[in-house]
Interface confidence: low
Amino acid sequence: KKVVLGKKGDTVELTCNASQKKNTQFHWKNSNQIKILGIQGLFLTKGPSKLSDRADSRKSLWDQGCFSMIIKNLKIEDSDTYICEVENKKEEVELLVFGLTANSDTHLLEGQSLTLTLESPPGSSPSVKCRSPGGKNIQGGRTISVPQLERQDSGTWTCTVSQDQKTVEFKIDIVVLAFQKASSTVYKKEGEQVEFSFPLAFTLEKLTGSGELWWQAERASSSKSWITFDLKNKEVSVKRVTQDPKLQMGKKLPLHLTLPQALPQYAGSGNLTLALEAKTGKLHQEVNLVVMRATQFQENLTCEVWGPTSPKLTLSLKLENKGATVSKQAKAVWVLNPEAGMWQCLLSDSGQVLLESNIKVVPTW
């Protein structure tokens, strides 16, 4: 007998063909011999089965000897062997209906787990293979688990259910709630305005929640809350902000913070958290601020950086258009009795300049 796989909620068409290409008597019955539908004269008649309000046939194809049965809004319990009786012969079709659903909300925080559950008819032994938008393949039986969702898991998951060499494909849209970046570093000269941006890696029609930026300054012994805010339908409103520094916050997404000026005492690391309404857990993004200062005091020219720098970074003092250079993998460099001219302080990573500050040394007469 023929096997047909269907998806819960979908429509399926079971075909039945007569040898004569003409309109003739036919009946569809279930395995209990209860009539579902058939033809009486020129009219479609329906029997007392549970399918009567969801079963139909393509009348336009009857003249061609095609007597299909269409079942709408499929249910798992529609799985059965259906018998088509036409021209004194019986055709059997086994229909197996499957459903695949996410156990929880399909909007999940990064790091949370996703479980997909397969609903299947008794006696079936299907296998499931799912492919994430990022190309990750996961196999399973009745359940498929993804223990820790990542940003790249956002999008349409394609799951193939296989049974008796037949397959049916499900598409499930998963949204991973996360910031676009896990971490970012801003490099600024002392006194410059600092812009922090926290773009989200998803879009939701209604986005409501609350957030906070905690800051651990390099010079401070403990962290402190710099700002707390609310998010209502993508509109941002500040709840509380420290007096020093007095941050400003944009009213629209993406979340945007402005520090009026970069100062050594602000250099350090921050953690922006965002708690979304009706979600357990929080979104996190780390942000780092590195501040540079170049100064001349008496006979000493000094360049310093504050904030989280990697040991690989190089700090250099260089006299413009001259070979004079001092470089160190350290947070401060200095030159005693510097030559007159324009000096550059450079913070670089493998030759790539991250931050630059110029200071003019005037000749001492």
Epitope: R151, G155, Q180, K181, S350
Partner: antibody, heavy 120, light 107 residues
Framework: EVQLVESGGGLVQPGGSLRLSCAAS????????MSWVRQAPGKGLEWVAN????????YYVDSVKGRFTISRDNAKNSLYLQMNSLRAEDTAVYYC?????????????WGQGTTVTVSS | AIQMTQSPSSLSASVGDRVTITCRAS??????LGWYQQKPGKAPKLLIY???SLQSGVPSRFSGRGSGTDFALTISSLQPEDFATYYC?????????FGQGTRLEIK
């Protein structure tokens, strides 16, 4: 200066092998996904493969799966494409490119390309 | 795989003209689309990322818009150096897919 330089292209017979290299400089190579993109003579661009920062994930276009292998050596700031069982339709200029930091951020740095000709 | 349909395949325009090139995805891709310019014998150059963000160093006459399935690149006032081939690129999931390209020629 941020730079990518490809090498290793040349003339090879159908069924032969070739290994392309891409030397990166001027940026933290180990912090970026990297891609190979090719362009057949007179044709458009085709993405071939890419590799995660630490090499733990690799993706390929269907037409090269099982024949091409993308790899990287972060200590040498180098990206590679091992091409086996080469076919005439693999004839193209091959570019290495730096992937943006996350989805939707494009390929922001490209090499000048290296030419691969597969012909008997 | 998601298909990208880019149009037109070629376009003739004059210096100072405003031109628009479009790309349509066979299914929704959020805003994960970039636009590239390529001149003969040269490597492609990223102009627009994330559908509408201008890449650093790219002139402001280039702009991108769209999300979901329909995207467009507009050059507000063509300059002589803008005559080239333009490609859209979907990097939402694998395989990454380029549009067929649009050749922009001097009328």
């Amino acid at each position: 200066e941020v730079q990518l330089v490809e090498s290793g292209g040349g003339l090879v017979q159908p069924g032969g092998s070739l290994r392309l290299s891409c030397a990166a400089s001027g940026f933290t190579f180990s912090s970026y996904w990297m891609s190979w993109v090719r362009q057949a003579p007179g044709k458009g661009l085709e993405w071939v493969a890419n590799i995660k920062e630490d090499g733990s994930e690799k993706y390929y276009v269907d037409s090269v799966k099982g024949r091409f292998t993308i790899s990287r050596d972060n200590a040498k700031n180098s990206l590679y494409l091992q091409m086996n069982s080469l076919r005439a339709e693999d004839t193209a200029v091959y570019y290495c490119a730096r992937d943006g930091s996350y989805s939707g951020y494009g390929m922001d740095v490209w090499g000048q390309g290296t030419t691969v000709t597969v012909s008997s | 795989a998601i298909q990208m349909t880019q149009s037109p395949s070629s376009l003739s325009a004059s210096v100072g003209d405003r031109v628009t090139i479009t790309c349509r995805a066979s299914q929704g891709i959020r805003n994960d689309l970039g636009w590239y310019q390529q001149k003969p014998g040269k490597a492609p150059k990223l102009l627009i990322y994330a559908a509408s963000s201008l890449q650093s160093g790219v002139p402001s006459r280039f702009s991108g818009r769209g999300s979901g399935t329909d995207f467009a690149l507009t050059i507000s006032s063509l300059q002589p150096e803008d005559f080239a081939t333009y490609y859209c690129l979907l990097d939402y999931n694998y395989p990454y897919t380029f549009g067929q390209g649009t050749r922009l020629e001097i009328k």
